[in-house]
């Protein structure tokens, strides 16, 4: 037999809380346990489910869990079935609801001195107790013409008067908890002597110098008073207008008219209605002055055919918000189509070349209008007017390569030389029409050139080869004045290049032939042993068949190269004494001597009183100071060569003589004594 060890029992439960109906059975064989609710099988859900043979509730629900539960145990082999005792929940709950008007049937029927009944729609189990509030203040039963019926959850106002006006709310509490009304009721019982709003003034926006009208009306019994105030509480009447409201008129119906509105009239206007009893009613409205600022400029736009583009028109700041529209050729754009206006945007879909032109964005409000043009160019791919041609350019002369194209907008042309972009410099110049000018053609300019012409719609390119026609020239040009050392071997080179290899020949400028000890070997003039007579003017002549001949004149000087007869020595001098640095040079032509001290040339005309350079080249420095210390260089030069030699100068303090040393003791180092 099936025996229930634990049976479910009826119990208190709280709405939304956990609960458990216990059921435990003992049987000889396996049994299958399930639950019934009011005789119907209970299906497991996330909220209510079997836990072993017990039934568990995650959150008790007063609607779904009301009824009788029963635990059923069944032996599937024998078919025996046992049922537990019935169990049910006593579910405690409370639920908020609104405060509603029970009597009269509608708010429109509420009149002074009638009975008004309000109902609190908070419900619960066990039945809660109720508390009523007006404007947040608790109401106690039997006070001030009202009755609270807790059984019917009603509040009755008998008779209702203006003093009962306010916001009514209710709260209720029970063993389960507390709840307050989800929606409150505003009771408004007018006192005929209180001012009531009939017509409230609205905010207005007007253009400067135009007129503005505010309407305002109140009603009461007896009729209420009405007064207009501006900003600083200045009253506005037809008899006493403030200075800045000279053009204000208050009409008998309460309307206020302002004419010729100016900025100082903008602000808050208050209309105040006062009944015989009750508080004044203050209504506010603002007068705004319409305004419109200037529009920002548009940058010109370049679009490509076939694309979709948008141009946004930023409306100018303004009050009221300016409305915006686009025009093209005097026609407002539609709000759909291929070229249309969408919001503040100009939209051009599948752009055609014919769409190019000036589009105007207009903005307007009560304060006026603004407009701004945008120039739209529809770009086309460039086409050729003249391609660059393979060219022969003459060395040393300007050379031109054409790249003439046409497109909208004007195409941009760039040039490449050996695939490297040519940047404009002193040798290369790209003209506005695309032509490349090479200012002075060099031999190495003979290569490939490519020009590319582009617009946003695309680009075209072409290339050409440049061949440089080399000019007949000396490479390098001989120095026009050269020196040879007397009694020594000397050579004077001369070489040239041209379109054909030139022949090179030396001549004496006077036409006389070269002496036998002077040879002309493939352009190099060779002197076996230079004599005085070898000095003079010589001409190197280079010539070829196609280009003729060129000449270079050279003046040769025979010289005895410079040698130093006397060189300056390392010198140490006492501070305040005089230093002498000797230097003498010989050569032909007779050399000139210059001194360099402390890395600067000593200019004889600017030496000052302490320094002097003698005719023979020696340098004397009087009253030497420590800052005169350093390396001094003697530079000897003539028209043929230059030589230099240097020596250091040390300036030292004069030692104080020791007692052991006699006055005639020599210094510890070599000195110049003056």
């Amino acid at each position: 037999a099936i025996v229930f060890i634990k049976q479910p029992s009826s119990q208190d439960a709280l709405q939304g809380r956990r609960a458990l109906l216990r059921c435990e059975v003992e049987a000889p064989g396996p049994v299958h346990v399930y639950w019934l609710l009011d005789g119907a099988p209970v299906q497991d859900t996330e909220r209510r489910f079997a836990q072993g043979s017990s039934l568990s509730f995650a959150a008790v629900d007063r609607l779904q869990d009301s009824g009788t539960f029963q635990c059923v145990a069944r032996d599937d082999v024998t078919g025996e079935e046992a049922r537990s005792a019935n169990a049910s929940f006593n579910i405690k709950w409370i639920e908020a609801g609104p405060v509603v008007l029970k009597h009269p049937a509608s708010e429109a029927e509420i009149q002074p001195q009638t009975q008004v009944t309000l109902r609190c729609h908070i419900d619960g189990h066990p039945r809660p107790t109720y508390q009523w509030f007006r404007d947040g203040t608790p109401l106690s039963d039997g006070q001030s013409n009202h009755t609270v019926s807790s059984k019917e959850r009603n509040l009755t106002l008998r008779p209702a008067g203006p003093e009962h006006s306010g916001l009514y709310s209710c709260c209720a509490h029970s063993a389960f908890g507390q709840a307050c009304s989800s929606q409150n009721f505003t009771l408004s019982i007018a006192d005929e002597s209180f001012a009531r709003v009939v017509l409230a003034p609205q905010d207005v926006v007007v253009a400067r110098y135009e007129e503005a009208m505010f309407h305002c009306q109140f009603s009461a019994q007896p009729p209420p008073s009405l007064q207009w105030l501006f900003e600083d509480e200045t009253p506005i009447t037809n008899r006493s207008r403030p200075p800045h409201l000279r053009r204000a008129t208050v009409f008998a119906n309460g309307s206020l008219l302002l004419t010729q509105v100016r900025p100082r009239n903008a602000g808050i206007y208050r209309c105040i209605g006062q009944g015989q009893r009750g508080p004044p009613i203050i209504l506010e409205a603002t007068l705004h002055l319409a305004e419109i600022e200037d529009m920002p400029l548009f940058e010109p736009r370049v679009f490509t055919a076939g694309s979709e583009e948008r141009v946004t028109c930023l409306p100018p700041k303004g009050l009221p918000e300016p409305s915006v529209w686009w025009e093209h050729a005097g026609v407002r754009l539609p709000t759909h189509g291929r070229v249309y206006q969408k919001g503040h945007e100009l939209v051009l879909a599948n752009i055609a070349e014919s769409d190019a032109g000036v589009y105007t964005c207009h903005a307007a409000n009560l304060a006026g209008q603004r407009r701004q043009d945008v120039n739209i160019t529809v770009a086309t791919v460039p086409s050729w007017l003249k391609k660059p041609q393979d060219s022969q350019l003459e060395e040393g002369k300007p050379g031109y390569l054409d790249c003439l194209t046409q497109a909208t907008p004007k195409p941009t042309v760039v040039w490449y030389r050996n695939q490297m972009l040519i940047s404009e410099d002193s040798r290369f110049e790209v003209f506005k029409n695309g032509t490349l000018r090479i200012n002075s053609v060099e031999v190495y300019d003979g290569t490939w050139y490519r020009c590319m012409s582009s617009t946003p719609a695309g680009s075209i390119e072409a290339q050409a080869r440049v061949q440089v026609l080399e000019k007949l020239k000396f490479t390098p040009p001989p120095q026009p004045q050269q020196c040879m050392e007397f009694d020594k071997e000397a050579t004077v080179p001369c070489s040239a290049t041209g379109r054909e290899k030139p022949t090179i020949k030396w001549e004496r400028a006077d036409g006389s032939s070269l002496p036998e000890w002077v040879t002309d070997n493939a352009g190099t003039l060779h002197f076996a042993r230079v004599t005085r007579d070898d000095a003079g003017n010589y001409t190197c002549i280079a010539s070829n068949g196609p280009q003729g001949q060129i000449r270079a004149h050279v003046q040769l000087t025979v010289a005895v190269f410079i040698t130093f007869k006397v060189e300056p020595e390392r010198t140490t001098v006492y501070q305040g004494h005089t230093a002498l640095l000797q230097c003498e040079a010989q050569g032909d032509p007779k050399p000139l001597i210059q001194w360099k001290g402390k890395d600067r040339i000593l200019d004889p005309t600017k030496l000052g009183p302490r320094m002097h350079i003698f005719q023979n080249g020696s340098l004397v420095i009087h009253d030497v100071a420590p800052e005169d210390s350093g390396r001094y260089t003697c530079i000897a030069g003539n028209s043929c060569n230059i030589k230099h030699t240097e020596a250091p100068l040390y300036v030292v303090d004069k030692p104080v003589p020791e007692e052991s040393e006699g006055p005639g003791s020599p210094p510890p180092y070599k000195m110049i004594q003056t």
């Epitope: 253009a207 400067r208 110098y209 135009e210 010729q260 419109i292 409305s323 005097g330 026609v331 407002r332 539609p334 709000t335 105007t360 307007a364 409000n365 009560l366 304060a367 006026g368 209008q369 603004r370 407009r371």
Partner: antibody
Framework: QVQLVESGGGVVQPGRSLRLSCAAS????????MHWVRQAPGKGLEWVAV????????YYADSVKGRFTISRDNSKNTLYLQMNSLRAEDTAVYYC?????????WGQGTLVTVSS | DIQMTQSPSSLSASVGDRVTITCRAS??????LAWYQQKPEKAPKSLIY???SLQSGVPSRFSGSGSGTDFTLTISSLQPEDFATYYC?????????FGQGTKVEIK
């Protein structure tokens, strides 16, 4: 309040010229586009010309193009219509009008009679 | 040029009647249409812009509707001061063009 007062109308012979003026007050003249509209006796309204607020853009009806010129002097708050080579069919009351989005204020008009 | 055609050319009505005037454009003009009222020997007065927006100070019995090519001016309850000639005008493109007018007379 907005006021537009036209002047300069009168009787004129065909082929002669006349200049109409329109004095504006009660608003900021330089902020608004201005129109001339005319009405022949017993007929409907006919738009004549418009000038943008800054004076940079002007449009004309085909019937007056090349003969009439619209202009404005923002410093004087005045709109003008210079009418040359007048014809009998130009006889009408000429109104000047202010535009915000569309025309919102009209003057009282001035009568131009072209007659020999 | 855009042609504007008003219908009817004239109509007779009584005070309190609902009156409708139509205006048709020869091509689409979006909502760029205005209505004007003109009384004999007076300048026109602006009633409606942008097809349906009421000018400031115009009584609410006047209303406008339509877009594209077909537009309507409605006076919900005709008042004695409403007997006048009414014109529509397109301002979609230049030249601006007016309808030929509709005269509203007392029946």
């Amino acid at each position: 309040q907005v006021q537009l007062v036209e002047s300069g109308g009168g009787v004129v012979q065909p082929g002669r010229s006349l200049r109409l003026s329109c004095a504006a007050s009660g608003f900021i003249f330089s902020n608004y586009a201005m129109h001339w509209v005319r009405q022949a006796p017993g007929k409907g309204l006919e738009w004549v010309a418009v000038i943008s607020y800054d004076g940079n853009n002007k449009y004309y009806a085909d019937s007056v193009k090349g003969r009439f010129t619209i202009s404005r002097d923002n410093s004087k708050n005045t709109l003008y219509l210079q009418m040359n080579s007048l014809r009998a069919e130009d006889t009408a009351v000429y109104y000047c009008a202010r535009e915000v989005w569309s025309i919102d204020n009209w003057g009282q008009g001035t009568l131009v009679t072209v007659s020999s | 040029d855009i042609q504007m055609t008003q219908s009817p050319s004239s109509l007779s009505a009584s005070v309190g009647d609902r009156v409708t005037i139509t205006c048709r454009a020869s091509q689409g003009i979006s909502s760029w249409l205005a209505w004007y009222q003109q009384k004999p020997e007076k300048a026109p007065k602006s009633l409606i812009y942008a097809a349906s927006s009421l000018q400031s100070g115009v009584p609410s019995r006047f209303s406008g509707s339509g877009s594209g090519t077909d537009f309507t001016l409605t006076i919900s309850s005709l008042q004695p001061e409403d007997f006048a000639t009414y014109y529509c005008q397109q301002y979609n493109s230049y030249p601006r063009t007016f309808g030929q007018g509709t005269k509203v007379e007392i029946k």
